[in-house]
C-alpha cells in the first residue's frame, strides 16, 4: 500500500481500550521503527473480520506485550 511510507504508523487512531478475548485470532506488536515512532498493538480478529488497533497504554495491551516478550526472550 502506498500509504505506508516512512513515518507512517499502521493505526490511524489511538487504539481501542479492549477487544473481546474470544474474538482474537492473533496479536502483533509493532515496535518503534523508521516507519512509526511508537509501539502499536494490532489485533487480528477471528472469522476474517479484519484487524483492530489496541491502545498500547491499555491494561489488555500491556498484558499482551508482556506475554509476547516473555515468549520471545
Amino acid at each position: 500500500f502506498p500509504m505506508f511510507k516512512r513515518g507512517r504508523c499502521l493505526c490511524i487512531g489511538p487504539g481501542v481500550k479492549a477487544v473481546k478475548v474470544a474474538d482474537i485470532e492473533k496479536a502483533s506488536i509493532m515496535y518503534p521503527s523508521n516507519n512509526c515512532d511508537k509501539i502499536e498493538v494490532i489485533i487480528t480478529l477471528k472469522e476474517n473480520k479484519g484487524q483492530r488497533c489496541l491502545n498500547p497504554k491499555s491494561k489488555q495491551a500491556r498484558l499482551i506485550i508482556k506475554k509476547v516478550e516473555r515468549k520471545n526472550f
Partner: nanobody, 127 residues
Framework: EVQLVESGGGLVQPGGSLRLSCAAS????????IGWFRQAPGKEREGVSS????????YYADSVKGRFAISRDNAKNTVYLQMNSLKPEDTAVYYC????????????????????WGQGTLVTVSS
C-alpha cells in the same frame, strides 16, 4: 450521550461547492480517527475521506481526490469536508464516523468503522 451530527448538505448545481460539518457530543473527537462516507440510492456505502487522530494523515477515494478536502478543528470538536467541483455522481447521503481502532488500510472501508456513526446529511448535485 455519545453522538455525531452531520450538517451542511443541500441542493447544489454541478461545479458548485458545499462544506459538510461533523460535530461530536459526549466525547472528544481528537481521540478518534474520523471518516466521511456516502451512500447513493441503491448503492453500497463507500469511503470518501478520513483523517487520523494524531498526525492528521488524510485519505481520499480516487473519485474525490483534488476536489474534496477533510480537516479537523479539535477546539470546536468538529470535522469538516470541503467539497468543490461537485458532480451529479456525488449525490448521496453523507455520513461521518469516529473510531479509535481503525488500521490505515481500512481508512476508507465503512464496514471496518465500528464505533460511532452519524445519521447523515443529504447532498444533491443537480441543475
Amino acid at each position: 450521550e455519545v453522538q455525531l451530527v452531520e450538517s451542511g448538505g443541500g441542493l447544489v448545481q454541478p461545479g458548485g461547492s458545499l462544506r459538510l460539518s461533523c460535530a461530536a457530543s459526549g466525547f472528544t473527537l481528537d481521540d478518534y480517527a474520523i471518516g466521511w462516507f456516502r451512500q447513493a440510492p441503491g448503492k453500497e456505502r463507500e469511503g470518501v475521506s478520513s483523517i487520523s487522530s494524531s498526525d492528521g494523515r488524510t485519505y481520499y477515494a480516487d473519485s474525490v481526490k483534488g476536489r474534496f478536502a477533510i480537516s479537523r478543528d479539535n477546539a470546536k470538536n468538529t470535522v469538516y469536508l470541503q467539497m468543490n467541483s461537485l458532480k451529479p455522481e456525488d449525490t448521496a447521503v453523507y455520513y461521518c464516523a469516529a473510531d479509535q481502532g481503525v488500521v490505515a488500510y481500512d481508512a476508507l472501508r465503512p464496514y471496518r468503522w465500528l464505533e460511532v456513526w452519524g445519521q447523515g446529511t443529504l447532498v444533491t448535485v443537480s441543475s
